[in-house]
């Protein structure tokens, strides 16, 4: 089981958009996987800020909630094992490590459940 995101770091200019793809390969279990996106900001690298989820509409942390509701930040499912995170207008505080997490409560499986990529906002 492997979660694949683009090779980083990614560089984008503030005010522009970014799309970060994520797909899971070599997995066992349901064909339709759930995805969660987190941001780890440089000033708090051990704090996972929930951005958006394919499963839970209440997943977003307060810092992202209004932008998710407005559709500025969204997760789009491409297929059962692939999604893309879209952020319409990047802000300086969007810089950090983005984690694509494929949550599982099934203890039968083995592998890696996340992929991470750094985004730098210029």
């Amino acid at each position: 089981r492997e979660v694949l995101v683009p090779e980083g770091p990614l560089y984008r200019v503030a005010g522009t958009a970014v799309s970060i793809s994520c797909n899971v390969t070599g997995y066992e279990g349901p064909a339709q996987q759930n995805f969660e996106w987190f941001l780890y900001r440089p000033e708090a690298p051990d704090t996972a800020l929930g951005i958006v989820s394919t499963k839970d509409t209440q997943f977003s942390y307060a810092v992202f909630k209004s932008r998710v509701v407005a559709g500025e930040v969204q997760v789009q499912r491409l297929q059962g094992d692939a999604v893309v995170l879209k952020i319409a207008r990047l802000q300086a505080q969007d810089a950090g490590i983005y984690e694509c997490h494929t949550p599982s409560t099934d203890t039968r499986y083995l592998g890696s459940y996340s992929g991470k990529v750094e985004l730098r906002v210029l």
Partner: antibody, heavy 115, light 107 residues
Amino acid sequence: EVQLLESGGGLVQPGGSLRLSCAASGFTFSSYAMSWVRQAPGKGLEWVSGITGSGGSTYYADSVKGRFTISRDNSKNTLYLQMNSLRAEDTAIYYCARGGALDIWGQGTMVTVSS
Amino acid sequence: DIQMTQSPSSLSASVGDRVTITCRASQVIHNYLAWYKQKPGQAPKLLIYSASSLQSGVPSRFSGSGSGTDFTLTISSLQPEDFATYYCQQSYSTPLTFGGGTKVEIK
């Protein structure tokens, strides 16, 4: 009853080889990932290797990569660990265990690497 | 690789005591954390999985909590059969890694 039973341990000289087996019963073997975990005398637990239920993906600790090979035969409900180029530091009890959260363990088989 | 740091490495307690063991991961592992108990000469036994889920057949005096990087195993009232060594383990990514263990001894 869900059970794992290891075999194949023993005394081997440095540089030698050994093949461990783990016979599973009481559950659908092919539905579970499996792992080998070892414990050197008086020490803690060290994960050695793992394999997905289908056998399609294998994983290794850096300490054994290139020397050990994990495999499984789902038709025989058996997990294997082929250990080559054995070193003194590989001396340990080797356990097979089920899943990602290792919910079922065998009783272990002792591997001693010594001249 | 993800490092798992357990503390304390050993502790002395009496029957009936409340015992707390902590485990810290070197990076966020969400809730992919298990706890095991091992008695001398025996294989480890799973107590807690997914950080806080009690394995079937395990007494309710055992509980787990935490998420992210910091986790806790609590034994609410220590029983004679609980004197053993306890290990945490992450299954968030391979290689799976264990904490160094906590030996719970009789005071």
